[in-house]
């Protein structure tokens, strides 16, 4: 579950000429509202279609009447986010109309009148807990400039709002792979986990406990290659018992892509690759300067400064596309399990497992919990044939026998200081650097490398490492 | 504890239909496989399907598939296998298993006999 | 459908020997093999997954190997309890397969 929220900024006159009459007038002042519809996927739907993940009202904007001979400005708007709550997951891809109202307050017999002023429509690619997106519709002589984003309601967390967070089993941290919820850091995420033994190379899944197949790949973990011999054509859902390819239309087929964008296959769907000018899921939004913040993901923008000009997005790793709009990094759902490591090598992923663990996800535990004893209070946790020591703290090692000096590693970088803590370490770090282990420069201008402190804590502080 | 509970054994006429069910407790019903696989008497084990809660999703054993429908109810965590156009060699123990958390049918139900005869 | 061939159908044996099954798939099933042990009007139990690696409560005894089309079940010190059926399987492709399986007898 989770919200939709959309941020409207400003609705007024598009460049170029032609300008459009006020909607308002001394005689017939008005004031603005809009209505946002969602729907799932890539719809193709008529507008009238259902708002299938939701729908929202914003607040009537104030009043305005427009001043005799001067040109629309841009109008008036109401306050606050509009917001479309969704109980079940996000779909990642999804259908946007925004419309655009005025209400007229004149002495008209029955109460306000109402008509529609403009309507846009677009398809998005949008993970949720992502940064704001920005974005540019036009309708006619109107043009609409507004932010969007999807974050997930608590316990539910991920770029799909699938994953939840479950309170701690221990107070200090989270079980192995397992990361602190945030903001609820008192708590830990419960990975997505898919059928297990599912191919980390050629499987997936949306759902829990599911194993869907990249294209070319079948059988109940993904792990057979498709033979194509026997088929007609080399496209479309595979048959799970012959493993056969049946014949698809190909999701580039009629080239959905506007603007002179190219389109490639994905093994679920398609991408386009947008010219200079141009971004959207289908390349279908254009006239736009570094001014509109084109760049998403955090992408740095260089160049544009009228719509005739070229930009250049340059990305953060991790994000690519002429916008920044296309993620690389597959690792961020966590396939690897028990605090593997995750190599995204581009064909495939890789988990690198941590002692005592195995397995394509790291999913086999190597040891055995029987007969083994944990010293100074540590405690064995079983799991599937497996043995692990909880060491409580101030303890290590494998068996909990040695005393854990957290300092003895030297954690604190650029010659911070450590302190032993009860819950950990503390670094104090020397002036000019940052962070829990101090590893962060402060910036001559007083920005840091990080995206922020956390709140209350200033650069330079000691910083505690859990 | 994981336990999955079968329903009391049946005796059917050549030609019917039986619908054998499985219930699941102590775990997130809707995360994981419910497999079935039957077994004739003094024989070996055949797999027969499976389905997938959350999402409904199942592959059938091709063997089966004309004659074989597997159901799930999530108000009662409960996976239905229906049998039809039943023969006597259909006589078998019928076994609900969870794929679990490693790959393989970590649990099963206590089985479930279904006799045909005339 | 890949067969699973289980050898020995029966085997004699005394508490204490080392006991050996073997089992050939039809075709390359990659490590995706299990072993589930059987006794009478009972449900099957699981052994070994990934042809190698033990479930959760499952002694040390008994050992999975193999990769591709051959794969071994061992039981280094047959004890009393584990007089019983034992049946690989495959789930690498659909349909999931089971060998015949293979009978443990007190000789």
């Known amino acids: 579950a989770g919200v939709f929220e959309l941020q409207i900024h400003s609705f007024g006159p598009g460049p170029g000429p032609g300008a459009p009459r006020s909607p308002c007038s001394a005689r017939l002042p008005c004031r603005l509202f809009f209505r946002v519809c969602l729907k799932p996927g890539l719809s193709e739907e008529a507008a009238e279609s259902p708002c299938a993940l939701g729908a929202a009202l914003s607040a009537r904007g104030p009043v305005y009447t427009e001043q005799p001979g001067a040109p629309a400005p841009d109008l008036p708007l109401p306050d606050g986010l509009l917001q479309v709550p969704f109980r079940d997951a996000w779909p990642g891809t999804f259908s946007f109309i925004i419309e655009t109202w005025r209400e007229e307050l004149g002495d008209q017999i029955g109460g306000p009148a109402w008509s529609l002023l403009a309507r846009v429509a677009g398809r998005r690619r949008l993970a949720a807990g992502g940064p704001w997106a920005r974005d540019i519709q036009r309708a006619g002589a109107w043009e609409l400039r507004f932010s969007y984003r999807a974050r997930c309601e608590p316990p539910a967390v991920g770029t799909a709002c699938t994953r939840l967070c479950r309170p701690r089993s221990a107070p200090s941290r989270c079980g192995p792979g397992l990361r602190p919820c945030a903001p609820l850091e008192d708590e830990c995420e419960a990975p997505l986990v898919c059928r297990a033994g599912c191919s980390p190379e050629h499987g997936f899944c949306e759902q829990p406990g599911e194993c869907r197949c990249l294209e070319g790949w079948t059988g109940p973990l993904c792990t057979v290659p498709v033979s194509t011999s026997s088929c007609l054509s080399p496209r479309g859902p595979s048959s799970a018992t012959t493993g056969c390819l049946v014949p698809g239309p190909g999701p580039c087929d009629g080239n959905p892509c506007a603007n002179g964008g190219s389109c490639s296959e994905t093994p679920r769907s398609f991408e386009c690759t947008c010219p200079r000018g141009f971004y959207g899921l289908r390349c279908e939004v254009s006239g736009v300067t570094c001014a509109d913040g084109p760049c998403f993901n955090g992408g740095l923008c260089v160049g544009g400064a009228d719509p005739d000009s070229a930009y250049i997005c340059h990305c953060p790793p991790g994000f690519q596309g002429s916008n920044c709009e296309k993620r690389v990094d597959r690792c961020s759902l966590q396939p690897c399990r028990n605090g593997g490591l995750c190599l995204d090598l581009g064909h495939a992923l890789r988990c690198r497992c941590r002692a005592g663990f195995a397995g394509p996800r790291c999913e086999h535990d190597l040891d055995d919990c029987a007969g083994r004893a944990c010293a100074n209070g540590g405690t064995c946790v079983e799991g599937g044939g497996a043995h692990r020591c909880s060491c409580a703290l101030g303890f290590g090692g494998r068996d909990c026998r040695e005393r854990a000096d957290p300092c003895a590693a030297r954690p604190c970088a650029h010659g911070g200081r450590c302190y032993a803590h009860f819950s950990g370490l503390v670094c104090a770090c020397a002036p000019g650097y940052m962070g829990a282990r101090c590893e962060f420069p402060v910036h001559p201008d007083g920005a840091s490398a990080l995206p922020a402190a956390p709140p209350g804590l200033r650069p330079g502080d000691p910083q505690r490492y859990l | 504890q994981v336990q999955l509970v079968q329903s009391g054994a049946e005796v059917k006429k050549p030609g019917a239909s039986v619908k054998v069910s499985c219930k699941a407790t102590d775990y997130i019903f809707s995360n994981y496989y419910i497999e079935w696989v039957r077994q004739a008497p003094g024989q070996g084990l055949e797999w027969m399907g499976e389905?997938?809660?959350?999402?409904?999703?199942?592959v059938y054993n091709e063997k089966f598939k004309d004659r074989v429908t597997m159901t799930v109810d999530t108000s009662t965590s409960t996976v239905y296998m229906e049998l039809s156009s039943l023969r006597s060699e259909d006589t078998a123990v019928y076994y609900c298993a969870r794929w679990g958390d490693y790959a393989l049918f970590a649990n099963w139900g206590q089985g479930t006999l279904v006799t045909v005869s005339s | 459908d890949i067969q699973m061939t289980q050898s020995p159908s029966f085997l004699s044996a005394s508490v204490g020997d080392r006991v050996t099954i073997t089992c050939k798939a039809s075709q390359n099933v990659g490590t995706n093999v299990a072993w589930y042990q059987q006794k009478p009007g009972k449900a099957p139990k699981p052994l070994i997954y990934s042809t190698s690696y033990r479930y959760s409560g499952v002694p040390s005894r008994f050992s999975g190997s193999g990769s591709g089309t051959e794969f071994t079940l061992t039981i280094s010190s047959l004890q009393p309890e584990d007089f019983a059926t034992y049946y690989c399987?495959?789930?690498?492709?659909?349909?999931?397969?089971f060998g015949g399986g293979t009978k443990v007898e007190i000789k």
């Open positions: 399987q495959q789930y690498n492709n659909y349909p999931l397969t």
């Open positions: 389905i997938l809660p959350g999402t409904g999703n199942t």
